[in-house]
Structures are given as C-alpha cells and as structure tokens.
C-alpha cells in the first residue's frame, strides 16, 4: 500500500501532502519542499525529509570509541539537493555558491570550496554509532532487555532488517547502538541505516516524523527510557578529506 487509503495520509511521513490522485483514485503522497512522490509503506529518505523540513514554516562490556575518521553533523540544517531517487547529491552548494561534498547521510566530508569543487561520487556511510545518555533511574536497565527492546524498535518501527543492528552496548547511563550496512549488503527494498538513524534521532528529540501522536514512548520492562543527550557518529567507506587546519583546530 502506498498510503493509508481510508483518510489518505502517509503513516511514515507527516511532512507530506496527500490526495487521491494516484492511479485508480489511489491515495498518493508527495514530500513537502521537493514535491516528490514517496512510498508511505517505508521510511522517506533523509534528503527529502531535510528538504521538507527547510520548506516547512519555522516552529565489562566496553563502549565503542569512535574512530578518528568518524564524522559528527556539526553543520546542522541546510536545504539539500536530492537526486531523482531522493538520495543526497554528492555535491551540495548554498545560495552564496559555497560548495562541499557530503556522504550518503548528507553530512559534510570535505572542506568547503567554490563552484569548481568536484565530488566524484556519493560516498556511502556504512557504520553509524548512536550514542545516548539516559536520565538517572532507580537502577541500571537490564542489558539484555534493553538490547531486545532497541532491536525490536529498529525492526518494527523503522523497518530496518535486524542484521543491520550490529550491537547494542550499555554502561549506565550510556547506551550505544551500532548500525552497519555496506553497499554490498543493502538489497533493493532495504531501509538505509542513515534513514533509520535520522527517524530515531527525531523521535528521541520529541519531533516524530510518523503520522499520529507525535512522541516516542520507549519502555524497558515498563520503565520509560528518557534520553538526555544524543550524539551520532558517521563512518564512511572512504575516509573524509579535510585539511590539516581543520584536524588540528
């Protein structure tokens, strides 16, 4: 199904405009900002979501140490260029002709340049580390319960195949979720780890992208998991190219 037929809405993306103008009067939904048709049975790509967001009115287990090549999205929001399939274009430019290269999750991976900057290919982000700190609780969460509930969340809410959730680490109060997905592993129809991570990030911040009540209520054995801080690290298949000046700053 492409959308909820009864009231013609998109269950997986509230930032859409839907109308029964599809083939045979079927409900069809288009992303705000780009006007691209979206498949409401799965997650919408992060590129289209960012574009929609910019167009909307303003309102003994050890934790993983991110590698030296891990990227953090420090640049924040921008209005991206998306390709016809909704993916980020390798080169992004702003209105003042400043350009940079991005990875498959839209995070800058080079220094900024001018219109002459070349980005030969869209480099895939194959490893995402989601680092969370939860609010103090009476006791630590049981690690296996936490692991099971987070895996269930990614499988059922974000429709991410379980094989792409590589690990869930826990050292109270820090939780780390590792997502891994190489180009060769991702089959047609598979949800991209970058899209799943973005939906999760928005959910955790109380800005759910799903149609409906607008909040994520994540519980481990009945106790709400309240996240105080979120950091997301992105690792690309090819290391990023930044000047030494940035690396020493």
């Amino acid at each position: 199904h492409t959308a909820a037929q009864d009231n013609c809405t998109c269950p997986t993306n509230k930032m859409t405009v839907c109308s029964p103008d599809g083939p045979g009067g079927r409900c069809q939904c288009r992303a705000l900002g780009s006007g691209m048709a979206v498949d409401c049975s799965t997650l919408t790509s992060k590129c289209l979501l960012l574009k929609a967001r910019m167009s909307a009115p303003k309102n003994a287990r050890t934790l993983v140490r991110p590698s030296e090549h891990a990227l953090v999205d420090n640049d924040g929001l921008y209005d991206p260029d998306c390709d016809p399939e909704g993916r980020f274009k390798a080169r992004q430019c702003n209105q003042t002709s400043v350009c940079w290269c991005v990875n498959s999750v839209g995070v800058r991976r080079t220094d900024k340049g001018d219109l002459s900057l070349r980005c030969d290919e869209l480099v895939r982000t194959h490893h995402i580390l989601i680092d969370l700190r939860h609010r103090p609780t009476a006791g630590a969460f049981n690690h296996s319960d936490l692991d099971a509930e987070l895996r269930r969340l990614f499988r059922e809410r974000y429709r991410l195949h379980p094989k792409f959730v590589a690990a869930v680490h826990y050292e109270q109060p820090t939780i780390q979720i590792e997502l891994r997905q190489n180009t060769s592993q991702k089959a047609a129809g598979d949800v991209d780890i970058g899209d799943a991570a973005y939906y999760f990030e928005r959910d955790i911040k109380g800005e759910s992208l799903f149609q409906g009540r607008g909040g994520l209520d994540l519980r481990v054995r009945g106790e709400p998991l309240q996240v105080e801080r979120t950091l997301i690290y992105y690792l690309d298949e090819i290391p990023p190219k930044f000047s030494m000046k940035r690396l020493t700053a």
Partner: antibody
C-alpha cells in the same frame, strides 16, 4: 480492525480465583502490550497490570501478590488470573491495548467482563 | 507510586457552557528529553468502555471534537470543553504513564 474480546465467568465464590481471557485480533501480541483494568460498581478505574510485547509483566503493587498475567502469542490470547477474591473485587474487568512506541495510552478496550464475587 | 488527584469530583453544567476540570500528579510527568508529558484523558459514558480522548497531555485523538482541549505540564493538567454538548455527559479520567499507570478518581459531568 483492532479488536479485544473478553471471556470469563461472571460469578466467583469468595476465596476462589478468577480467570479471564482477552482474545485479540487485528494486531500481534509480539508488537503491542495488553493491560488489565477494573472498575468497582459506581467507582473509578484501577490499573491492575500489563503484559508487554516482549513478554515481561508489571503489576499494581497493591495487588501484585494476587495477580498473574500470561499470554499465548500464537493464539493471540492474554490471560488474567486473580487469587483469593473477596466481595470488594466485584466489578467490571477490562483488557486494553497500549499504543506501543506511540505512548502507553489505552486506545482500544475490550467490552468488559462483569465479575460478581458472591 | 504516583498519585493522581482530580477535581472537582462532579460538575453540573448547562449545554453550551465552558467547562474545565483539573488533574494533579504527585510528581512531574514531564520527559525533559522529548518535552512530552506522560498524561492521558479518557471519557467513559454509562455502560461503555472508556475512550481515549487526549494523549501526551494535549494531543487530541483522531475523531475527537476540537471542543476538547488538554493542557498543562509537569504536575498540573486541565481538560477543557469549550461548549458542552449533551453527548459529553460522562465521567472523565486522567491517567499517568510516567511510572507504570495510575488513574485519577474521575470527574463526573452532569446536566444542571
């Protein structure tokens, strides 16, 4: 569509146990939790306990020693068992589904089972 | 355990009147991360199962008339009916889900 149908005896003798079954359709018990709530005649609602999607349970602390909730995912059934009933356990007993990650709200309720302890 | 206190316990109104009822919790129901409150409002008409009206303290459920408004944060919450209709006569319950679940004692809405 989502439905919860309850079945169980209407009359229970004092000191005996109560067993009610909630049979669900339109959703899977591996994806949604099911709660039990009761309401004495002319009184308010009292939460009894919950069977979470993952199989764990939580109970009202005041009633924990007398309550047991279990489920059979393959049969789409959740079971409430309550021991040592007294006359003040008389009332309507409901099962209700929570909304999974959209919030522990009870958006779908069973029709209720009237239990009389006499 | 979190206690929920509703007031008044009953309320006699005329059709068209504006009505407000209060719900107070013994501790804050606010999730500071998502800025959402774990509070819901239910409506129960005689002989019927309760019906969910409001979730997250202020999110109206699909199909609920817009004369119903939930507000408040932390420990103090309010349900307002802007213009009471005959079909609104019922008992209204608040419920916390911050730490398992507790219902308030209810507010009964009656016709004057």
């Amino acid at each position: 569509q989502v439905q919860l149908k309850q079945s169980g005896p209407g009359l229970v003798a004092p000191s005996q146990s109560l067993s009610i079954t909630c049979t669900v359709s339109g959703f899977s018990l591996t994806s949604y939790g099911v709660n039990w709530i009761r309401q004495p005649p002319g009184k308010g609602l009292e939460w009894l306990g919950v069977m979470w999607a993952g199989g764990s349970t939580n109970y009202n602390s005041a009633l924990m020693s007398r309550l047991s909730i279990s489920k059979d995912n393959s049969k789409s059934q959740v079971f409430l068992k309550m021991n040592s009933l007294q006359t003040d356990d008389t009332g309507m007993y409901y099962c209700a589904r929570d909304e999974n990650w959209d919030g522990a709200w009870f958006a779908y309720w069973g029709q209720g089972t009237l239990v009389t302890v006499s | 355990d979190i206690q929920m206190t509703q007031s008044p316990s009953s309320l006699a109104v005329s059709a068209g009147e504006k009505v407000t009822m209060s719900c107070k919790s013994s501790q804050s129901l606010l999730n500071s991360g998502t800025r959402k409150n774990y509070l819901a409002w239910y409506q129960q008409k005689p002989g019927q199962s309760p019906k969910l009206l409001i979730s997250w303290a202020s999110s109206r459920e699909s199909g609920v008339p817009d004369r119903f408004t939930g507000s408040g944060s932390g420990t103090d919450f309010t349900l307002t009916i802007s213009s009471v209709q005959a079909e609104d006569l019922a008992v209204y319950y608040c419920k916390q889900s911050y730490n398992l679940f507790t219902f308030g004692g209810g507010t009964k809405l009656e016709l004057k």
